[in-house]
Interface confidence: medium
């Protein structure tokens, strides 16, 4: 038997992926475990093999279909179970009634690019990936810029309270290397959380013209 406290957390990417993390204090390291998804109103079910991500936590992705297919709706409830093999049997270790649109975490924004750069400002655009059409414009973004000599954690957060897939960064220093990241969150869902940060976009401001004030 497996003792200890268990935590089972899953998020839906709004299209065709449910990502789950199961942590269990005192779990057996050599036990084979999986997540089983049983939707209450769909004629399919899905499993994924839990793989270790740390000493006491495992993760897996339930791939429900093609990346941009709308596999679940706001009314779906998916029974998610962690099943671990005990001899010839599977034992239910954790269970939750998962409401996909209450537990959203979108994919990180993609295709970041510099639209226009000057000495003191830079206009950057991006795209959202695999986001449901249900959201329409009900999304918000956070962005951060990494300045020389600082860490990402020190970077101030810029909040965009609407679906705006671009930003104009102001008051930058000329001829300086920066990095930029953005993340997205739907306004819907009691347990919805921010997407992962995008891959950083590196850019350099233009040098100031000689003889001009900076």
């Amino acid at each position: 038997a497996v003792n200890g406290t268990s935590q089972f957390t899953c998020f839906y990417n709004s299209r065709a992926n449910i990502s789950c993390v199961w942590s269990q204090d005192g779990a057996l390291q050599d036990t084979s475990c999986q997540v089983h998804a049983w939707p209450d109103r769909r004629r399919w079910n899905q499993t994924c093999e839990l793989l270790p991500v740390s000493q006491a936590s495992w993760a897996c992705n339930l791939i429900l279909g093609a990346p941009d297919s709308q596999k679940l709706t706001t009314v779906d409830i998916v029974t998610l179970r962690v099943l671990c093999r005990e001899g010839v049997r599977w034992r239910v270790m954790a269970i939750q009634d998962f409401k996909p649109f209450e537990n959203l975490r979108l994919m990180a924004p993609i295709s970041l690019q510099v639209v226009h750069v000057e000495t003191h400002r830079c206009n950057i655009s991006w795209e959202i990936s695999q986001a449901s059409h249900y959201f329409e414009r009900h999304l918000e973004f956070e962005a951060r810029t990494l300045s020389p000599g600082h860490t990402w954690e020190e970077a101030p957060l810029l909040t965009l309270k609407q679906k705006q897939e671009w930003i104009c960064l102001e008051t930058l220093t000329p001829d300086t290397q920066y990095e930029f990241q953005v993340r997205v969150k739907p306004l819907q869902g009691e347990f919805t959380t921010w997407s992962p940060w995008s891959q950083p976009l590196a850019f350099r401001t233009k040098p100031a013209a000689l003889g001009k004030d900076t």
């Epitope: 109103r41 009314v75 269970i95």
Partner: antibody
Framework: EVQLLESGGGLVQPGGSLRLSCAAS????????VHWIRQAPGKGLEWLGA???????QYNAAVKGRFTISRDNSKNTLYLQMNSLRAEDTAVYYC?????????????WGQGTLVTVSS | DIQMTQSPSSLSASVGDRVTITCQAS?????LYWYQQRPGKAPRLLIY???NLASGVPSRFSGSGSGTSYTFTISSLQPEDIATYYC?????????FGQGTKVEIK
């Protein structure tokens, strides 16, 4: 064979409480969601709420806070606890289960139990 | 909440007649069901997911529609079809039913 059997109905005074039971057989309540639906005399059907296979509940806002759905897995039985009852809660109360998927609609119904709220 | 409006609220037809009931939703729904309720009995599922016949249901019953407009048809009314018929949506919570259509024999 899937069967649902409600009990616990009767006459209750306004402001009183009542607990209805729904005994399930032919399936496990930990594998299917079960719903409560009522029908006032001569009126239509009103969905009250559900308890899902994992044990979480969902309610119609019209009764949320007054009605509570629970279950006893060992008895394979569902409950509807009704508090602060009003005359307009007078109805036949049904428990119902969908087919293998909710996609299939309410394929299984109990026979209903009558609740009368009157002084 | 999604309002489901059935019409007519009652109808009287002869044995063998074709009977049609409509159900209008206040917004688009994607999962629609039809139930039959005989006097003093629990409802019985007839049609699931708009047009699929539930197990054991005679083929004279059928359903169609999409979006906000749905239709239920009895191709040849039989004496045992005397009942009230309800539509129900399962596209959003709370689940809602139509107010019912009472079918009688002339």
């Amino acid at each position: 064979e899937v069967q649902l059997l409600e009990s616990g109905g009767g006459l209750v005074q306004p402001g009183g409480s009542l607990r209805l039971s729904c005994a399930a057989s032919g399936f496990s309540v930990t594998s299917y969601g079960v719903h409560w639906i009522r029908q006032a005399p001569g009126k239509g059907l009103e969905w009250l709420g559900a308890i899902w296979s994992g044990g979480s509940t969902q309610y119609n806002a019209a009764v949320k806070g007054r009605f509570t759905i629970s279950r006893d897995n060992s008895k394979n039985t569902l409950y509807l606890q009704m508090n602060s009852l009003r005359a307009e809660d007078t109805a036949v109360y049904y428990c119902a289960r969908a087919g293998d998927y909710n996609y299939d609609g309410f394929a299984y119904w109990g026979q209903g139990t009558l609740v009368t709220v009157s002084s | 909440d999604i309002q489901m409006t059935q019409s007519p609220s009652s109808l009287s037809a002869s044995v063998g007649d074709r009977v049609t009931i409509t159900c209008q939703a206040s917004q688009s729904v994607s999962f629609l069901y039809w139930y039959q309720q005989r006097p003093g009995k629990a409802p019985r599922l007839l049609i699931y997911d708009t047009s699929n016949l539930a197990s054991g249901v005679p083929s004279r019953f059928s359903g169609s529609g999409s979006g906000t407009s749905y239709t239920f048809t009895i191709s040849s009314l039989q004496p045992e079809d005397i009942a009230t018929y309800y539509c129900q949506q399962w596209s959003t919570y709370p689940l809602t039913f139509g107010q019912g259509t009472k079918v009688e024999i002339k």
